[in-house]
């Protein structure tokens, strides 16, 4: 794995008010230690699928099986937890889907669906047909175990019917659930038979039981909530970027590096150079020059634009991203062709990223 000596001092000056590079909340898959987990890459028309974990290329091994659009992890351990991505490489573009894996005592997870269809859950009965409470939509109650990233909104539903119309109340860990039991309280939408908690925190973990009752009977259903705490992580670079490119002498070219980072990233574009006729320093490490970095004079550090290129511009260009936690590094090659040759974007050459890590 490459290391290098920098020609320039890379200590950065205080920056302009930085841009936020925020990962949108990915779907969370939960497995208990020792269990197997199977995830399907939710991307369409994928010619080739590559997988990464925490930004590092994921290959098959004795516990990880990659078959088509499926990732299987056998005998999961807590070390399998992390941010995963599958990238579908197509002939004209590529797309990446991110998801989290949390290996914990909770067994299942997923996002709760929106109440787009809640009205049909409120069932009116013929007034003569007295009836004890019953569930009207058990499909919406199948997922008992919910693993949700901290700060997300959680919704538990218990669609029911009965005559007279039953009432609904909620328990937490078997005891009456009061508004003062959590900061910000909670909402109960009786019309949709739902309990809603916004901005969940670790203290919200536990068992939530809906009790639905009328004078003819009582039914209940329990959900388990696990709040998955996010922790700071190293930058993650989108697989396949920057992409290899070619252009003719005098042409222009652009390299793009897509960065995902919770913490403020410092982006550098680096190229191998020669110093005193040598490509390597006395320590045996290659000389590298910082062409651009995020900071006061950089308009968009994720893009490196080269104009009026010469043959000397050919070579490897490295996008190196660092935050206070760690680093990530990927590179692409620029081919400079003589003027008579037609240039072409080498989109198909998106091999596994070359990580410094």
């Amino acid at each position: 794995r490459p290391s290098f000596s920098l020609v320039e001092d890379t200590t950065l000056e205080p920056e302009e008010p930085p841009t936020k590079y925020q990962i949108s909340q990915p779907e969370v898959y939960v497995a208990a230690p020792g269990e197997s987990l199977e995830v399907r890459c939710l991307l369409k028309d994928a010619a080739v699928i590559s997988w990464t974990k925490d930004g590092v290329h994921l290959g098959p091994n004795n516990r990880t099986v990659l078959i088509g659009e499926y990732l299987q992890i056998k005998g999961a351990t807590p070390r399998d937890s992390g941010l995963y991505a599958c990238t579908a490489s197509r002939t004209v573009d590529s797309e990446t889907w991110y998801f989290m894996v949390n290996v914990t005592d909770a067994i299942s997870s997923g996002d709760d669906e929106d109440d787009t269809d809640g009205a049909e859950d409120f069932v009116s009965e013929n007034s003569n047909n007295k009836r004890a409470p019953y569930w009207t939509n058990t499909e919406k109650m199948e997922k008992r175990l919910h693993a949700v990233p901290a700060a997300n909104t959680v919704k538990f539903r218990c669609p029911a019917g009965g005559n007279p119309m039953p009432t609904m109340r909620w328990l937490k860990n078997g005891k009456e659930f009061k508004q003062e039991h959590r900061i910000g309280g909670y909402k109960v939408r009786n019309q949709h038979w739902s309990l809603i908690m916004e901005s969940v925190v670790p203290s919200d973990k536990g068992n939530y039981t809906c009790v639905v009752e009328n004078e003819y009977g009582s039914i209940n259903h329990t959900y388990h909530l696990d709040v998955v705490e996010r922790s700071p992580h190293r930058p993650i670079l989108q697989a396949g970027l920057p992409a290899n490119a070619s252009t003719v002498v005098g042409g222009d070219v652009e390299f793009v590096c897509k960065v995902y980072s919770d913490a403020q990233p410092h982006i550098q574009w680096i190229k191998h150079v020669e110093k005193n006729g040598s490509k390597y320093g006395p320590d045996g490490l290659p000389y590298l020059k910082v062409l651009k970095h995020s900071g006061i004079n950089s308009s968009n550090a994720e893009v490196l634009a080269l104009f009026n290129v010469t043959e000397a511009d050919a070579g490897e260009y490295i996008c190196k991203v660092s935050n206070y936690i760690g680093q990530a590094n990927q590179s692409a090659w620029l081919t400079v062709l003589p003027k008579q040759q037609a240039p072409g974007r080498e989109k198909e050459i998106t091999a596994s990223p070359d990580y410094l890590e």
């Epitope: 290391s3 000056e13 920056e15 930085p18 841009t19 700071p232 760690g326 680093q327």
Partner: antibody
Framework: EVQLVQSGAEVKKPGASVKVSCKAS????????MHWVRQAPGQGLEWMGA????????NYNQKFKGRVTLTRDTSISTAYMELSRLRSDDTAVYYC??????WGQGTTVTVSS | AIQLTQSPSSLSASVGDRVTITCSAS?????MSWYQQKPGKAPKLLIY???NLASGVPSRFSGSGSGTDFTLTISSLQPEDFATYYC?????????FGQGTKLEIK
């Protein structure tokens, strides 16, 4: 369990150098910056610099550049901070920290003639 | 270097009180971290990336803010919360801390 274990307290004379070690365990040492922070008696926290063990990238606080040297030995998952030309106002507790949430127990360095 | 100024520098409060500590930056930042430190101990991360609660930290701690003004709030003080609190920016070199806010029992 993640642990950062630092070397023991040191007493040095002005002008001397001190080298503090920080041994990491429980996580992949090479994948995370190792930061060094110091705290003078009764004072606040001051960031000195950081080293990225995988490739030896280093960022220094300019205040200490020329006096502080950060190194690492990946074979034993240990980072080192050496401070030279010690002065009495370098008397402080020196911490190593990684990810912001892992901290060593601190190493007290006393500079006194 | 970006300077971080905390206010107040010291604060007396009682168990059960709601306490707010502010941190003002000399330049705009995207994120702020907050630490708690007790005498003779290493700092403990409370909040990272402005509002994310660190693992194992009670939910009575919360963080907010953007740009140059950031806040740490303790919704209901507990006896173990009496300590010194520091803000820190990890956005721009050199990384810097606030001067600290000492929270004492009234």
């Amino acid at each position: 369990e993640v642990q950062l274990v630092q070397s023991g307290a040191e007493v040095k004379k002005p002008g001397a150098s001190v080298k503090v070690s920080c041994k990491a365990s429980g996580y992949t040492f090479t994948n995370y910056w190792m930061h060094w922070v110091r705290q003078a008696p009764g004072q606040g926290l001051e960031w000195m610099g950081a080293i990225y063990p995988e490739n030896r990238d280093i960022n220094y606080n300019q205040k200490f550049k020329g006096r502080v040297t950060l190194t690492r030995d990946t074979s034993i998952s240990t980072a080192y901070m050496e401070l030279s030309r010690l002065r009495s106002d370098d008397t402080a507790v020196y911490y190593c920290t990684s990810r912001g949430d892992y901290w060593g127990q601190g190493t007290t360095v006393t500079v006194s003639s | 270097a970006i300077q971080l100024t905390q206010s107040p520098s010291s604060l007396s409060a009682s168990v059960g009180d709601r306490v707010t500590i502010t941190c003002s930056a000399s330049s705009g930042l995207s994120y702020m971290s907050w630490y708690q430190q007790k005498p003779g101990k290493a700092p403990k991360l409370l909040i990272y990336d402005t509002s994310n609660l660190a693992s194992g930290v009670p939910s009575r701690f919360s963080g907010s803010g953007s740009g140059t003004d950031f806040t740490l709030t303790i919704s209901s003080l507990q006896p173990e919360d009496f300590a010194t609190y520091y803000c820190q920016q990890w956005s721009s070199y050199p990384y810097t801390f606030g001067q600290g806010t000492k929270l004492e029992i009234k």
